[in-house]
């Protein structure tokens, strides 16, 4: 059986939309599937790599690599999206390409970044971990770390940094899929909202879905002990 909830929820474009949340009900009247997984049920994607989930994550990453920061022209906010999802008339799509990106580092002025921009994250304004010396952030946003400390400045002069961020990574469903969404939408969908991250590639949704002990390598499920737990 399915339990359907419908509600008006604030979405990425800053408007309220009617959203459906469909929950598979437990036939025996008990915990939901997500709760059972958290309690240690035999759920194979938590025990070993699942090809379907792996392909989903790779596809999400490929899309994210090509994303940019969509900044609303009315200063209502910004969100990480694909160019096609960013209004050409109502917003500005901040995406580095060709010669428009910043240099990789202040010591290497010739090599420009082509991957980015990212809403609320920039190697030029992140103090921790700083992009410098032997630890320059790669020219691939899907390999960027979470910035834990921003430079102390109210304004940077960068469109993608001085905007109000409207969406962050949200882990939805037992498949461990990730979407950049508003907190409101994420909570309605019973997802896990990552306040600390800016990109889906910075979070490991399956690790969150599975719960229990974190994977040794966040990308490799290793909860073999589930075989004995259930």
């Amino acid at each position: 059986a399915q339990h359907v909830t419908t509600q008006l929820v604030l979405r990425n474009k800053g408007v309220y939309e009617s959203v459906k949340y469909i929950q598979q009900e437990n036939f025996w009247i008990g915990p939901s599937s997500i709760d059972l997984i958290h309690l240690g049920a035999k759920f194979s994607p938590c025990i070993r790599k699942d090809q379907q989930i792996e392909q989903l994550v790779l596809r999400e990453r490929d899309l994210e690599r090509d994303s940019g920061c969509c900044v609303q022209n009315d200063h209502s906010g910004c969100i990480q999206t694909q160019r096609k999802d960013c209004s050409e008339t109502l917003a500005t799509f901040v995406k580095w390409q060709d010669d428009t990106g910043p240099p990789m580092d202040k010591s290497d002025l010739g090599q420009k970044r082509t991957s980015g921009a990212v809403c609320h994250q920039d190697p030029r304004t992140c103090e921790e971990p700083a992009s410098s010396g032997a630890h320059i952030w790669p020219d691939d946003i899907t390999k960027w770390p979470i910035c834990t400390e921003q430079a102390k400045s109210n304004r940077t002069g960068f469109l993608h940094m001085d905007c109000q961020i409207k969406g962050r990574p949200c882990c939805i469903s037992t498949k461990g899929s990730c979407e950049i969404t508003t907190r409101e939408y994420c909570e309605f969908m019973h997802g896990y909202f990552h306040e600390e991250a800016t990109l889906c590639s910075q979070v490991h949704c399956l690790d969150k879905v599975c719960g229990l002990l974190p994977f040794l390598n966040p990308e490799v499920p290793d909860q073999f002990y589930r075989l004995w737990l259930s």
């Epitope: 010669d99 428009t100 990106g101 910043p102 240099p103 202040k106 010591s107 002025l109 010739g110 420009k112 030029r124 304004t125 103090e127 700083a130 410098s132 430079a151 102390k152 400045s153 304004r155 940077t156 002069g157 960068f158």
Partner: antibody, heavy 123, light 106 residues
């Protein structure tokens, strides 16, 4: 308000070492992304970049003068320094220090300049 | 090093006249910076990243260009615009400035 002020010896003789100080306020060289640069301008001529120093103590020099230049900073005193060894009459110029910022810029730029200090090298 | 050649070296314009000066780079650069220096004063930044107006700079100043060819335009000359103008690149070390364009009031 950001201000910078250069100070130097005014006059010195060839082969001596020129020591310049840039005292600034309104920003700190311990702040991420900040830098201070030195630029000179012989009377009636154009601008020449000499060197700059970053918040993380990285230093960059004009290769044509590198062997004679030393840039340093005293973060707690809000000061930056430039030494030019073995000066010659060709080093006679107005010396400016300037704050480096990347506000809104893909690169960096000299966004606030000091008033300059005139240095004459003469025997 | 990237050599920047400014032209003309000297020019004069009447109030209200449109003024355009150019900066040619010896090799391709990503963007250009423009500084204004009035007699007896230190330089101040006018334009950063080729076309962005620095804080407090009047909207009559515009910058444009790409690759090896850049320009600074004053839509309507005013008496206070009489000054020397320098272009500068931050594309590679050593950082270089152009020799300047001196703009006089006619």
């Amino acid at each position: 308000q950001v201000t910078l002020k250069e100070s130097g010896p005014g006059i010195l003789q060839p082969s001596q070492t020129l020591s310049l100080t840039c005292s600034f306020s309104g920003f700190s060289l311990s702040t991420f992304g900040m830098g201070v640069g030195w630029i000179r301008q012989p009377s009636g001529k154009g601008l020449e970049w000499l060197a700059h120093i970053w918040w993380d103590d990285e230093k960059y020099y004009n290769s044509a003068l590198k062997s004679r230049l030393t840039i340093s900073k005293a973060t707690s005193k809000n000061q930056a320094f430039l030494k030019i060894a073995n000066v010659d009459t060709a080093d006679t110029a107005t010396y400016y220090c300037a704050r480096i910022s990347n506000y809104g810029s893909n690169y960096w730029y000299f966004n606030v300049w000091g008033t300059g200090t005139t240095v004459t090298v003469s025997s | 090093q990237v050599v920047l050649t400014q032209s003309p070296a000297l020019m004069s314009a009447s109030p209200g006249e449109k003024v355009t000066m150019t900066c040619s780079a010896g090799s391709s650069v990503s963007c250009m910076y423009w500084y204004q220096q009035k007699p007896g004063s230190s330089p101040r930044v006018l334009i950063y990243d080729t076309s962005n107006l620095a804080s407090g700079v009047p909207a009559r100043f515009t910058g444009s260009g790409s690759g090896t060819s850049y320009s600074l335009t004053i839509s309507r000359m005013e008496a206070e615009d009489a000054a020397s103008y320098y272009c500068q690149q931050w594309n590679s070390y050593p950082l270089t400035f152009g020799a300047g364009t001196k703009l006089e009031l006619k």
